[in-house]
Interface confidence: low
Amino acid sequence: EDLKKVFPPKVAVFEPSEAEISHTQKATLVCLATGFYPDHVELSWWVNGKEVHSGVSTDPQPLKEQPALEDSRYSLSSRLRVSATFWHNPRNHFRCQVQFYGLSEDDEWTEDRDKPITQKISAEAWGRADC
Amino acid sequence: PYIQNPDPAVYQLRGSKSNDTSVCLFTDFDSVMNVSQSKDSDVHITDKTVLDMRSMDFKSNGAVAWSNKSDFACTSAFKDSVIPADTFFPSPESSC
């Protein structure tokens, strides 16, 4: 690989829609890993510090962000679906972690929106007590 | 897989960081429905994947669309797929 072309992913977690919760009594979190090259990543969801597989669906392969470009950067998405009551519990904590060339990137959903996000690429979510 | 009670819906999601990305989730649709790629190079749409909530014995199809475009809207995100008009759910404004 041309190491000059290595770009780590940016990872973000998107919280469930209140409309989905209201309509289905379920809550889907979406994790997006974007802008990485090459396409060697591993994505995992962690709930309360433990890796989970049930309720998880991840794209089978990364998507080229610019399909016409041979060396396009890539994106990958994943969904985690839980019950509305599980999401609503503020003690529950959700994190999406993306492994890229040994780097662990993650984003997390936190109650305190003013805290700086750590350099790790992760996405995590506390069951929201407020925003 | 066979989806027992399809209830197709498109929901708009909000990110944990103040980023410019808008995300739309298309979920709970029938397995016969196909999700088309966007003709807009600035809008990214994943293939459909199946999610299995084993503890609830519940499976659902889903696809995600996202974009950094300021005028990106969930109502038009999947416009190249055949989606009934009543699948689009409102995204309440943040009160924070």
Partner: nanobody
């Protein structure tokens, strides 16, 4: 906290109309969605209609064309106008609010609607 108080229930003949009201108090500025639900004797509670803070509405199939959900933000009140009532609409009608503050999900005590000749 959010408190919800329903009113407007009663006895009505088939084909008649009723308007239910749900008054919200407390942290109402944190509410994203209101909904009306109903529970008939011996049956599970079911959705009737939802309304978002953007006034987007969503109805159960059984309510489409007959029921209308609306809200008056200045009065913190949500209404359910029910027309062409049928005996199968007989139920305890509950107001629900979804908030951005834990515990998120609030319910009223319910108001009884009886459709009978």
């Amino acid at each position: 906290d959010v408190q919800l108080v329903e009113s407007g229930g009663g006895v009505v003949q088939p084909g008649g109309s009723l308007r239910l009201s749900c008054v919200a108090s407390g942290y109402v500025h944190k509410i994203n969605f209101y909904g009306w639900y109903r529970q008939a004797p011996g049956k599970e509670r079911e959705k009737v209609a939802h309304i978002s803070i953007g006034d987007q509405t969503d109805y159960a199939d059984s309510a489409k064309g007959r029921f209308t959900i609306s809200r008056d933000e200045s009065k913190n009140t949500v209404y359910l106008q029910m027309n062409s009532l049928r005996p199968e609409d007989t139920a305890l009608y509950y107001c629900r609010a979804l908030s951005r503050i834990w515990p998120y999900d609030y319910w009223g005590q319910g108001t009884l609607v009886t459709v009978s000749s």
